[in-house]
């Protein structure tokens, strides 16, 4: 099941989601999608990379603000709406049959409160959900549950790479990405 | 020398079920991943499904998405393609194929000709 | 998801003079960081399956005589028998494995003139 982030409408949410460039600076495609990974690509296309710079965006409110050259690929959608909740996904695709590392995360978008003041706000949902609250432009605010957050190494846990640590030997570690099995 | 031996193919009607084997010798199959590419008759090589090495993780081509499983049994170093709900269309000869790394189709099974008609 | 198309469809060829195959893909197979396109190219001869001849675009897999070669990058390669030979008479396919479910060309058939 996807790692819930929770967001205020108006607010800019953060979706974690990184990989380790092998050697440094040896960048891979990625795609962020709307919908839950589809066997390939992305479904529903918000933001998209090639080895070098972002070359597709379908709104002025998707960002990368992380230090994409070093894989930091974290998705900032900027004054979310309720119409923003659901779950996306972010595609790390590493070249090969089936390559890709995917991971799937819910982002859940709430009305603001009314009266409790903010920082009471993060205290109250992060106690009352184990799940992370995402707030402006700083990334992921504190869990409350330790180790609910994913890991955002990526973990490779699908098909062609989940196997054969001995075959995917230096054509992979020229691919581009740190691979590292679960 | 690395092998692959398949069976299970014959002739079928629409809506019908068949299962594909392949048998592994020559090296350790839950060491690769492996795929079954199809040939229609006096046609080119369509990708169809793949598994990872251990099974846990397997891919379907969106043509038999739904229909078609693809499995493996380390223990007997075999690898399967159930199929379900056959179509016309589906008519060709199957080949399991090994994958090198996570790259190209090093060693490729003799075929097996799956016919779906009435 | 990417398309391979090949051309010609098919070409005869006298015994011992050259056969030039080419294959484009739909976008760049290159990955610029390791600087290798992620193509392969197959032989298939009448009622056998295919058989690997070259990947990574100009790799020979063991035992092909060195009388094939491939060569392009980016989305246009090229599969060259230097000198044609009666053995030779199959259909060849190019195919990607840079991303997405792997593709094949549709196939090109070498024959004798």
């Known amino acids: 099941s996807e790692v819930e982030y929770i967001a205020e409408v108006g607010q800019n949410a953060y979706l974690p989601c990184s990989y380790t460039p092998a050697p440094p600076g040896n960048l891979v495609p990625v795609c962020w999608g709307k919908g839950a990974c589809p066997v390939f690509d992305c479904s529903n296309v918000v933001l998209r990379t090639d080895n070098r710079d972002v070359n597709d965006r379908t709104s002025g409110r998707y960002w990368l603000k992380g230090d994409f050259h070093k894989g930091d690929v974290s998705l900032t959608i900027e004054n979310v709406t309720l119409a923003d909740s659901g779950v996306y996904c972010c595609r790390i695709q590493i070249p090969g049959i089936m390559n890709d590392e995917k991971h799937n995360v819910k982002l859940v978008v709430i009305k603001p409160a009314k009266v409790t003041p903010a920082p009471t706000l993060q205290r109250d949902l992060t106690s009352a959900f184990p799940r992370m609250l995402t707030t402006g432009e700083h990334g992921p605010a504190e869990t409350q549950t330790p180790g609910s957050l994913p890991d955002v190494n990526l973990t490779v846990s699908n098909f062609f790479c989940e196997l054969q640590i001995f075959t995917l030997t230096n054509e992979l570690r020229d691919s581009g990405a740190t691979i590292r099995t679960a | 020398q690395v092998q692959l031996q398949q069976s299970g193919g014959g002739l079928v009607q629409p809506g019908g079920s068949l299962r594909l084997s392949c048998a592994a010798s020559?090296?350790?199959?839950?060491?690769?991943?492996m795929s079954w590419v199809r040939q229609a008759p006096g046609k080119g090589l369509e990708w169809v499904s793949g598994i990872s090495g251990s099974g846990g993780s397997t891919y379907n081509a969106d043509s038999v998405k739904g229909r078609f499983t693809i499995s493996r049994d380390n223990s007997k170093n075999t690898l399967f393609l159930q199929m379900n709900s056959l179509r016309a269309e589906d008519t060709a000869v199957y080949y399991c194929a090994k994958i090198f790394g996570s790259y190209y189709f090093d060693y490729w099974g003799q075929g097996t000709l799956v016919t779906v008609s009435s | 998801e990417i398309v391979m198309t090949q051309s010609p469809d098919s070409l005869a060829v006298s015994l011992g003079e050259r056969a030039t195959i080419n294959c484009k893909s739909s976008q760049s197979v290159l990955y610029s960081s390791n600087n290798k396109n992620y193509l392969a190219w197959y032989q298939q001869k009448p009622g056998q399956p295919p058989k690997l001849l070259i990947y990574?675009?100009?790799t020979r897999e063991s035992g092909v005589p060195n009388r094939f070669s491939g060569s392009g990058s980016g989305t246009d390669f090229t599969l060259t028998i230097s000198s044609l030979q009666a053995e030779d008479v199959a259909v060849y396919y190019c195919?990607?494995?840079?991303?997405?479910?792997?593709?094949f060309g549709q196939g090109t058939k070498v024959e004798i003139k």
């Open positions: 020559g090296f350790t199959l839950s060491s690769y991943a």
């Open positions: 195919q990607q494995y840079y991303s997405g479910p792997p593709t």
């Open positions: 990574w675009t100009s």
